[in-house]
């Protein structure tokens, strides 16, 4: 191959690359706590991610502190979780082949 | 109010494979951030939990019994079933199963079905 | 797969006794421990969640302290209707696991 020949991927549908990350899908945190949600994944091409909050589109705009959306790392962290955190987020990644999401729960103490 | 109740064959011999059934009422378990799981305590010994199903199909199981398990749902019919293949006589106990909501603790829980292995 | 030691094995107490049973976590296991009740030819009832959160309907000389790997279930004055096996449960991490449970017995 020269260099300037680049080698075509095959599409391949989004897939989670540390699934033992996400084997913990109930995260009870005290009032006032950090929590992270992370889902690694991988695809061709490359897949972006979402997030829902009980089944609707989850930006964090009507949230205190709001929330920060890490893509590199496939992750939302929410800082100073108050009761009306809690709920179901589910991680919605897709690409042009496929789509994968995976809920995790939230119960705030 | 909540019920939970299992039902199963009662006796089977070694090699056979051994069905149970969770039938429940009070929730569904189409709901967000539900669970079901079986656990089974040998008489007069501990508790050992088996299997859990979520809502949302989700299920995880005891590595050390994994490739003899299978956890299902009816989410329609209310009933949670469990599996396990090649039994033998350190499989005689008491089988319960068990809910968690938004919870990984037990809150409701049936009154156990006793399965006995014999040749 | 993470371990729950309980201790004592037995215990042996008089009505109006306070008491407190140990369970310990072969491994940090933060406030992911829960607390049920069994007595005999009955199912267990749940009695504390998350370590020290109280339960509905759970009489209030029942309480939990603890988080990491050391924690404790606490009764102010025992009552005879007390009288049974106590397992602690941890969920912390797959498989969930429970401890080997305490026997509570009339002295």
């Known amino acids: 191959l020269e260099a300037s020949e680049e080698v075509e991927l095959e599409p391949q549908a989004p897939y989670w690359t540390h699934p033992q990350r996400m084997e913990k899908k109930l995260h009870a945190v005290p009032a006032g706590n950090t929590v992270k949600f992370r889902c690694p994944a991988a695809g061709n091409p490359t897949p972006t991610i979402r997030w829902l909050k009980d089944g609707q589109a989850f930006h964090g705009e009507n949230r205190i502190g709001g929330i920060r959306l890490r893509h590199q790392h496939w992750s939302l962290v929410m800082e100073s979780v108050v009761p009306s955190d809690r709920g179901t987020y589910t991680c919605l990644v897709e690409n042009a082949v496929g789509s994968i999401r995976y809920n995790y729960l939230l119960d705030v103490l | 109010q909540v019920t939970l109740k299992e039902s199963g064959p009662g006796i089977l011999q070694p090699s056979q494979t051994l069905s149970l059934t969770c039938s429940f009422s009070g929730f569904s378990l189409s709901t967000s951030g539900m669970g079901v799981s079986w656990i089974r305590q040998p008489s007069g010994k501990g508790l050992e939990w088996l299997a859990h199903i979520y809502w949302d199909d989700d299920k995880r199981y005891n590595p050390s019994l994994k490739s003899r398990l299978t956890i299902s749902k009816d989410t329609s019919s209310n009933q949670v079933f469990l599996k396990i293949t090649s039994v033998d006589t350190a499989d005689t106990a008491t089988y319960y199963c068990?809910?968690?909501?938004?919870?990984?603790?037990?809150?409701?829980w049936g009154q156990g079905t006793t399965l006995t292995v014999s040749s | 797969d993470i371990v729950l030691t309980q201790s004592p094995a037995t215990l042996s107490v008089t009505p109006g006794d306070r008491v407190s049973l140990s369970c310990r976590a072969s491994q940090s296991i933060s406030n992911y421990l829960h607390w049920y009740q069994q007595k005999s030819h009955e199912s267990p009832r749940l009695l504390i969640k998350?370590?020290?959160q109280s339960i509905s309907g759970i009489p209030s000389r029942f309480s939990g302290s603890g988080s990491g790997t050391d924690f404790i279930l606490s009764f102010n004055s025992v009552e005879t209707e007390d009288f049974g096996m106590y397992f602690c449960q941890q969920s912390n991490s797959w498989p969930f696991t429970f401890g080997s449970g305490t026997k509570l017995e009339i002295k």
């Open positions: 998350y370590a020290s």
């Open positions: 068990a809910r968690d909501y938004y919870a990984s603790s037990f809150d409701y």
